[in-house]
Every structure is written in structure tokens, then in C-alpha cells.
Amino acid sequence: KEEQISFRDCAEVFKSGHTTNGIYTLTFPNSTEEIKAYCDMEAGGGGWTIIQRREDGSVDFQRTWKEYKVGFGNPSGEYWLGNEFVSQLTNQQRYVLKIHLKDWEGNEAYSLYEHFYLSSEELNYRIHLKGLTGTAGKISSISQPGNDFSTKDGDNDKCICKCSQMLTGGWWFDACGPSNLNGMYYPQRQNTNKFNGIKWYYWKGSGYSLKATTMMIRPADF
């Protein structure tokens, strides 16, 4: 019987000859467990594994710790791939993280981190980032050094407040910090002066809620 080829990430999918954007089945490192992810095979050379997407407010991002762990939503639309998979993947080899943002005026920007990984669940999926470049601000809108992940039922932030409950969504909150790409989705003309929206402070300021966001990762040696 023919051995089935498994892919750890979209870079491996790309290198196998699948160069069309779409949903692909990936396999957890050192496991047979599978997960569906959207692969961007066109942007910046392709091979990007999409780990988060916001675009229309169709999915509720005020989810539990377990939901953020395993992922939720639809890979073809708004979704969160899952902290456990991303943690395992990014601890296997070095990955870059690209965050692509769109505002309501037709502008686009990005932040690129040359090294990204998440700690294990035991360490609350703490985010680690190095080497910021890009057009979405010279200062990282994800607080440095990285913080633990927090959800509405898992308060690991550095605030005596409860960031995830106040600002909605799971995120690497500080107190609560200059970003939250998993905040409330606000439509056009309702997207300003919103403290709990989709925020990337060092591009659009504190009260501006973005139109669309994509977080994507790829091996650094791709």
C-alpha cells in the first residue's frame, strides 16, 4: 500500500508541488494527529501557514482557553489555527511570523518578526518574538518581552484587571498592551474610539479597529 505523505506546514506543502492557495491537511510534529489549515501559496514567495484571520466578523473570537488551544472557525474564512499546534510546530525549527493588516481606508501594512515561537501550554503559550521589520510601526505592537496567552477563562495577563474580559478575545495581553487582533469586529463607520476592537496601536492608534488581519508563519530557511 502506498505510504501517505504528511505535511507539517504549508512550506512543506508548497515544496511538494502544491502551489495553489487553499485548505490543506497538516500533521502535528511527531504525531499522526491532523489539523486543517489555510495555506497562502502566493504572498511573498508562498509557503505561509495562516494561523489567524479576521475579515468580516462572522466568527466569535471571545472563546475559551481550550478553544484557542485546539483552534476554531473556518480555515477558508475567519479562524484561529490553534495554540497547541503552533507551539509544537514553532519549537521544531525556526519560524518567521508575518502579520498583515488592512484598515477601512484601503491601506495595508505588515509586521514581520524574524523569529517567532510559542512556549508550551505549561508556560501558557507565551509568545517569543525577535527582529521586527515592516510598515505597521517601528515599535512592536505585541509587547516585548512576550507575555502569556490569556482568554476569558484563563487570566494570565499582567494587569490587576482582566484583559480578555475587558477587551474581548484571547491574546498575549500585557496590561493590556498595544495590540489585540482577536478583539471585537466593528464594521466601517463604527470602528473608531473602540477600546475593545481589533487593535494594532503602532500602526493605527488605540481606538481604531481594523478591517482585516492575517497572521502567518513560515520556516526561516524557506
Partner: antibody, heavy 129, light 109 residues
Framework: QVQLVQSGAEVKKPGASVKVSCKAS????????MHWVRQAPGQGLEWMGW????????NYAQKFQGRVTMTRDTSISTAYMELSRLRSDDTAVYYC??????????????????????WGQGTMVTVSS | SYVLTQPPSVSVAPGQTARITCGGN??????VHWYQQKPGQAPVLVVY???DRPSGIPERFSGSNSGNTATLTISRVEAGDEADYYC???????????FGGGTKLTVLS
């Protein structure tokens, strides 16, 4: 660990100015308001105002308007409080203290009234002729 | 401006329960924070948002707030609890922080 370290004791003449510093470490300086609170000998706590290190916005207590100036230098994570036209009744211990800015807003309209969870050790300012 | 009223002193025997009050007009509609200050030291936050405790503060410290009175309760009082205690609220009408006058807690020996 998280701490606020203040400058040393000062002795000033009436009419002079004093500038007290407060160096933050162990946390994101711009993510918290910095407050100044004073305590005259044997008296209670008196709030003087806050600065938002993120953008430099300030809110001073009415009593100190025109005499107090709060500034910050984000490159060294340090806040400053300058009090001018000193009088003998300004003799007090001056504390800096932080409170969270969860909205990451500069507008006072989005001020979050969080508690002062970390305090500096205090700076004694004596005003005497 | 908003005024907070605290009793100047409260005395209690070790092992007993101390209750320190903080009065203010409709204070129940505001979030109250409590600080402990020992002689020669900076204040320390012991209760915030009426009844929450920061990490490291013993469960013996609790708070409540309703109507015109907020209360800090210290159960099983120890000698080390002897200190001044201050309540604090944010007065949104003046955009100012207000402290109570402070209460000296004496633990009887």
C-alpha cells in the same frame, strides 16, 4: 522583578523647585499610568496627578495646577515630577505609583481607574529656610 | 469634590476580626481600593475593585462595598497587620483620585 526606584532626599529653600525621578523596571513602562502621591509628616495620602508615559498626557489635581509638571523619558523608563514655588507645607514624602492603562489610550476620556499596584520607596522633600 | 470618611483608629485583639469602614456618597457605585501602610514604608495595595486581592495578599483580607459604605475586613488579625489603612476611589466628576483620611489599626497585646 517589577519595581519603581526613586531619587534621593532633597532639601530646598522656599520659592525653589524640586524634581523627583522614578525609574521603572521589570514591566512595560508605557503600559501603565504613573501617579504621584505625597504624604506630609503624620498626615494622610494626597494624590497629585498622573502622566501617561505612552504619550505624555497628564492630569493634575486641582490643588497643584500651575505648580506641578510631570514628564517622562521612555528611553530610560523614568518619570519625573517637578514642583515649583515650594512652600514649607510642601515638606512631605513624595511617592510614585503605577496603575494599568489597559485600553492603551491617551485620551483621559478612556482613563481606567485601576488601583496603584506598585509604589516607589518614596522621596523625602524638606522645604526650609 | 468627593469626600471619603474613615474612622481615625480601630483596635482589635489578635485573632479577632477588624472592620475598617470608608464612607462616601453612593460609594457603592464606585470601585474602592484599599492600601496598607506600615511606619516608614510605602503603601501596599491589599484589596482592589471592592473585593479582589492582589497576589501575595493573604485571604484574611477581604472587602465589600454597597450603599454609602465600603468595608475592609481583616480576619484572624495578627500583630503584623498593625498599620495605617487608606481607602481610595476615582471621582469621575472631577477626574481626580481621592483618598480617605486613613485609619490606624492597633492590635492589642
Amino acid at each position: 522583578q517589577v519595581q519603581l526606584v526613586q531619587s534621593g532626599a532633597e532639601v530646598k529653600k522656599p520659592g525653589a523647585s524640586v524634581k523627583v525621578s522614578c525609574k521603572a523596571s521589570g514591566y512595560t513602562f508605557t503600559g501603565y499610568y504613573m501617579h504621584w502621591v505625597r504624604q506630609a509628616p503624620g498626615q494622610g495620602l494626597e494624590w497629585m496627578g498622573w502622566i501617561n508615559p505612552n504619550c505624555g498626557g497628564t492630569n493634575y489635581a486641582q490643588k497643584f495646577q500651575g505648580r506641578v509638571t510631570m514628564t517622562r523619558d521612555t528611553s530610560i523608563s523614568t518619570a519625573y515630577m517637578e514642583l515649583s514655588r515650594l512652600r514649607s507645607d510642601d515638606t512631605a514624602v513624595y511617592y510614585c505609583a503605577r496603575s494599568p492603562n489597559p485600553y492603551y489610550y491617551c485620551s483621559s476620556g478612556y482613563y481606567y481607574p485601576g488601583a496603584f499596584d506598585i509604589w516607589g520607596q518614596g522621596t523625602m522633600v524638606t522645604v526650609s529656610s | 469634590s468627593y469626600v471619603l470618611t474613615q474612622p481615625p483608629s480601630v483596635s482589635v485583639a489578635p485573632g479577632q476580626t477588624a472592620r475598617i469602614t470608608c464612607g462616601g456618597n453612593n460609594i457603592g457605585s464606585k470601585s474602592v481600593h484599599w492600601y496598607q501602610q506600615k511606619p516608614g514604608q510605602a503603601p501596599v495595595l491589599v484589596v482592589y475593585d471592592d473585593s479582589d486581592r492582589p497576589s501575595g495578599i493573604p485571604e484574611r483580607f477581604s472587602g465589600s462595598n454597597s450603599g454609602n459604605t465600603a468595608t475592609l475586613t481583616i480576619s484572624r488579625v495578627e500583630a503584623g497587620d498593625e498599620a495605617d489603612y487608606y481607602c481610595q476611589v476615582w471621582d469621575s466628576s472631577s477626574d481626580h483620585w481621592v483618598f480617605g483620611g486613613g485609619t490606624k489599626l492597633t492590635v492589642l497585646s
